[in-house]
């Protein structure tokens, strides 16, 4: 959940590409402004996954969250976090 | 802000070497299995996309970065 | 310049079908998914069905489910939405839309279920 | 499934007028949202996406903001053109919802 919160729109093509649904993909793509030879490449990743099937998807998408739960990822959330009310504190 | 190993994770998915990309999956989970599936995705990508598609992956991901919603 | 325009649409009786098509041009048609939106006479705009780019995927509202299909043919640039076990509430001139916000919209084709 | 309101459901103004039309949905739908006008018998006209991004043609009299769940369009100087059916609508995610639209007519 914490992953999400620091880049939705990252998760949300991630997700769209791994999961092999093409209409979720346009969607995502769309929120992106993507261009139409931005929207082939895109979809040339996807098809990669949708080859490997679904166990693929879920080794992929398992890489992604251990990635973005990692500490090297939670530390700098943590890190950000004591910025931010840093800079709320001093801002009162 | 995306996580800079998130950002290094996709940067070496589409620009690295499969070496390279296994590599980095390694670092995070090093399991025989999900190794093989980094490398099944990563050769298969580099045979999908020439250098014009990988710019323009690239593209979209400067475009989710630079996005308010990151 | 992007252009879709509709056809299909007519006089059908409770219970019968009709394929409505939407003819696209000005664009690279498989690049984007397509859209269905009905207009019920003197009502506002609902969503229908929704069709990926290379069609593997698609989405329909639950008042249409089971009964309508959407469906496209690249070669030809057209959209399709095949409508069975048509009832009076789907009475309405359907609008084929190109994005998801919408951006570009046929003229619309009106279909009457009556008896 | 995201319900989407509109407010207010019908409003009379003179040409010249500022108006203003909020839209309202029922989760957060962070920018995902568009705007349009529709004239009797005529096919919506999309005016706005992103929630405050202009459709290329659109005049700049017609401006949107907000994000999250509450949304405004904004009419500078209404013209007569403009007396039309104004209609919300998300694509935050599936099923796309639009409002129940907004009747500006002449007062």
């Known amino acids: 959940v914490k992953m999400a919160e620091t880049c939705p729109i990252f998760y949300d093509v991630f997700f769209a590409v791994a999961n092999g649904n093409e209409l979720l993909l346009d969607l995502s793509l769309t929120k992106v402004n993507a261009t139409e030879p931005e929207r082939t490449a895109m979809k040339k990743i996807q098809d990669c996954y949708v080859e490997n099937g679904l166990i693929s998807r879920v080794l992929d998408g398992l890489v992604m969250t251990t990635i973005s739960s990692s500490k090297d990822c939670m530390g700098e959330a943590v890190q950000n976090t004591v910025e931010d009310l840093k800079l709320n504190t001093l801002g009162r | 802000e995306i996580c800079p190993a998130v950002k290094r994770d996709v940067d070496l998915f589409l620009t690295g070497t499969p070496d390279e990309y296994v590599e980095q999956v390694a670092q995070y989970k090093a399991l025989p299995v999900v190794l093989e599936n980094a490398r099944i995705l990563k050769n298969c990508v580099d045979a999908k996309m020439t250098e014009e598609d990988k710019e323009n992956a690239l593209s979209v991901l400067d475009k989710i970065y630079t996005s308010p919603l990151c | 310049e992007v252009q879709l325009v509709e056809s299909g649409g007519g006089l059908v009786q409770p219970g019968g079908s009709l394929r409505l098509s939407c003819a696209a041009s000005?664009?690279?048609?498989?690049?984007?998914?397509m859209h269905w939106v009905r207009q019920a006479p003197g009502k506002g705009l609902e969503w229908v069905s929704s069709i990926s780019g290379r069609g593997r995927n698609s989405d329909h509202a639950d008042s249409v489910k089971g009964r309508f299909t959407i469906s496209r043919d690249n070669s030809k640039n057209t959209l399709y939405l095949q409508m069975n076990s048509l009832r009076a509430e789907d009475t309405a001139v359907y609008y084929c839309?190109?994005?998801?916000?919408?951006?570009?919209w046929g003229q619309g084709t009106l279909v009457t279920v009556s008896s | 499934d995201i319900q989407m309101t509109q407010s207010p459901s019908s409003l009379s103004a003179s040409v010249g007028d500022r108006i203003t039309i909020t839209c309202r949905a029922s989760q957060d739908i962070n920018n995902y949202l568009a705007w349009f006008q529709q004239k009797p018998g005529k096919a919506p006209k999309s005016l706005i996406y992103?929630?405050?991004s202009l459709q290329s043609g659109v005049p700049s009299k017609f401006s949107g903001s907000g994000s999250g769940t509450d949304f405004t369009l904004t009419i500078s100087s209404l013209q007569p053109e403009d007396f039309a059916t104004y209609y919300c609508?998300?694509?935050?995610?599936?099923?796309?919802?639009f409002g129940p639209g907004t009747k500006v007519d002449i007062k």
């Open positions: 609508q998300q694509y935050s995610s599936y099923p796309f919802t």
């Open positions: 992103g929630a405050s």
């Open positions: 839309a190109r994005t998801e916000y919408f951006h570009h």
């Open positions: 000005g664009f690279t048609f498989s690049t984007y998914a």
